[in-house]
């Protein structure tokens, strides 16, 4: 009788996280007695996957009945694979005696798992940044096998270019993961704006996913200011309002000052939304300019988003009375401690 | 069914000779090695002899040269064929699988009795 | 030869109990020893091959341990049935050969 070989038809077997994977092997004589065993890896650290005489291999079962002496059918399957279990695999032939000796290999089978990678979570700068800054976003997804990955990036459906990405480790790893930094220029109308880390990978059979950013939570849009002076409603009465414009996020606090003094703080609360996300609001005084001698600083200051305070002034003239006067008029005064104003928002 | 049936047991006089046959049925017979144990009444078992798959045999000392064992696969057959028989082998013969994949013995016959006596 | 000496050669036990006997071969056997019941009259029943495995059919009050040249068989509760001489038998090399057996009487 021809001496047994031990046969592995299988050069590679790939199975998906979670599956079961059948490992194939059979014998082609039945001498000499002895036990089949199983082995991840080759020399003196393959690791026992399943002794067909002794042990206790929870995952693994025969595909046959492998205790009879006429069974050569030693496949093996192995439950609930993960990305741990990749390797090759040997069903390896031994003789009966004290010790068991090995008699022969077969020719190993390579286990790929695949892993589907994790759902990529995109974050951003750790502080706002404002519009024609260059701000950087990065995307990290993990537990992915095999290697090979696809990683894009899109804003508002834009796709990027300007972006650096890794897959680690560079060598043999049971899984991957894969970091990635984007570059993105923001503007103003980015309040709405998101921005997409896309991942393929074989094991999302062309289902990419996708991980994303609000650009809300990235930009802040500084307010424009506008203070004008509207006509006189009534006899010694004139209106100043502060138009506060296109700012994001809502945050913000105006202070109303009269030739330098505080006269009134608030803080913004019934503002209007424009379509582009941002922000409008506005905030007025009236003034009873018969209670001034000298013209009048006014000035709208305002701090957006705890950042360094923006203002605007308008000069009122208090030695005439038009029905309407300018804004930003450059007028030299002493101030006045005269408290006859009144003020709102809207 | 997997069975083992002797037969050819018998008294015989001190130096003649016997042929046992074990007939298998309810199994692949060509693909287990097969063996002969013996008991002398009262006493233990003694292992006789085997025959491998592939027709090696073996024996222990006690009837090395006087025993031989055969297989006839076409016909799921075992036998033993005895000469020279000396007292000393009285005994319940029993044929038995090696049906385990290490050769474990996992079916036995019901047994033959040889007596040798003169 | 390897020989094996199992112990006790006899012993009484009642319905119910747990008991243990031992094989102890000569040399080293790795795990390839069988235990047997035999019963008046009757051939030998196969119970545990490679030390602790059970045959197909046997009930799990019968276990087996051991390895290298010290082993047990363990009856876990004794029912009238269990009553029989037990064997041990190494088989990892010609000639195979058996313990001398023990017998399990009823108290």
């Known amino acids: 009788e021809e001496e047994l070989q031990v046969i592995q038809p299988d050069k590679s077997v790939s199975v998906a996280a979670g599956e079961s994977a059948i490992l194939h092997c059979t014998v082609t004589s039945l001498i000499p007695v002895g036990p089949i065993q199983w082995f991840r890896g080759a020399g003196p650290a393959r690791e026992l996957i399943y002794n067909q005489k002794e042990g206790h291999f929870p995952r693994v079962t025969t595909v046959s009945e492998s205790t009879k002496r006429e069974n050569m059918d030693f496949s093996i399957s192995i439950s609930n694979i993960t990305p741990a279990d990749a390797g090759t695999y040997y069903c390896v032939k031994f003789r009966k005696g004290s010790p068991d000796t090995e008699f022969k290999s077969g020719a190993g089978t390579e286990l790929s798992v695949r892993a589907k990678p994790s759902a990529p979570v995109v974050s951003g700068p750790a502080a706002r940044a404002t519009p024609q800054h260059t701000v950087s976003f990065t995307c990290e997804s993990h537990g992915f096998s095999p290697r090979d990955i696809t990683l894009k990036w899109f804003k508002n459906g834009n796709e990027l270019s300007d972006f650096q990405t890794n897959v680690d480790p560079v060598g043999e790893s049971v899984s991957y993961s894969i970091h990635s930094t984007a570059k993105v220029v923001l503007t103003r109308e980015d309040v709405h704006s998101q921005v997409i880390c896309e991942v393929a990978h074989v094991t999302l059979q062309g289902d990419p996913l996708r991980g994303t950013a609000n650009l809300s939570e990235t930009i802040r849009v500084p307010p424009t200011l506008e203070v004008t002076q509207q006509p006189v409603r009534a006899e010694n009465q004139v209106n100043v309002t502060c138009q506060v414009r296109k700012f994001y996020p809502q945050r913000l606090q105006l202070t109303w000052l009269e030739n330098g003094n505080v006269s009134r703080t608030e803080t913004a609360s019934t503002v209007t939304e424009n379509k582009d996300g941002t922000y409008n609001w506005m905030s007025w005084l009236l003034v009873n300019v018969s209670a001034h001698r000298d013209d009048v600083k006014l000035t709208c200051q305002v701090e957006h988003d705890g950042q360094p305070a923006v203002s605007k002034s308008h000069d009122l003239k208090v030695s005439a009375h038009p029905k309407e006067q300018g804004s930003n008029t450059a007028a030299e005064n002493t101030g006045s401690n005269e408290r006859n104003i009144y003020g709102g928002s809207g | 069914e997997v069975q083992l049936v002797e037969s050819g047991g018998g008294l015989v006089q001190p130096g003649g000779s016997l042929r046992l046959s074990c007939a298998a049925s309810?199994?692949?017979?060509?693909?287990?090695?097969m063996h002969w144990v013996r008991q002398a009444t009262g006493k233990g078992l003694e292992w006789v002899s085997v025959i491998g798959i592939a027709g090696d045999t073996y024996y222990p000392g006690s009837v090395k040269g006087r025993f031989t064992i055969s297989r006839e696969n076409a016909k799921n057959s075992l036998y033993l064929q005895m000469n020279s028989l000396r007292v000393g082998d009285t005994a319940v013969y029993y044929c038995?699988?090696?049906?385990?994949?290490?050769?474990?013995?996992?079916?036995w016959g019901q047994g033959t009795m040889v007596t040798v006596s003169s | 030869d390897i020989q094996m000496t199992q112990s006790p050669s006899s012993l009484s036990a009642s319905i119910g109990d747990k008991v243990t006997i031992t094989c102890r071969a000569s040399q080293d056997i790795n795990n390839y020893l069988a235990w047997f019941q035999q019963k008046p009259g009757k051939a030998p029943k196969s119970l545990i091959y490679?030390?602790?495995s059970l045959q197909s059919g046997v009930p799990s009050k019968f276990s087996g341990s051991g390895s290298g040249t010290d082993f047990t068989l363990t009856i876990s509760s004794l029912q009238p049935e269990d009553f029989a001489t037990y064997y041990c038998?190494?088989?990892?090399?010609?000639?195979?050969?058996f313990g001398q057996g023990t017998k399990l009487e009823i108290k």
């Open positions: 490679t030390a602790s």
């Open positions: 038998q190494q088989y990892v090399s010609y000639p195979y050969t």
């Open positions: 309810g199994f692949t017979f060509s693909s287990y090695d």
């Open positions: 038995a699988r090696g049906g385990s994949w290490d050769d474990a013995f996992d079916i």
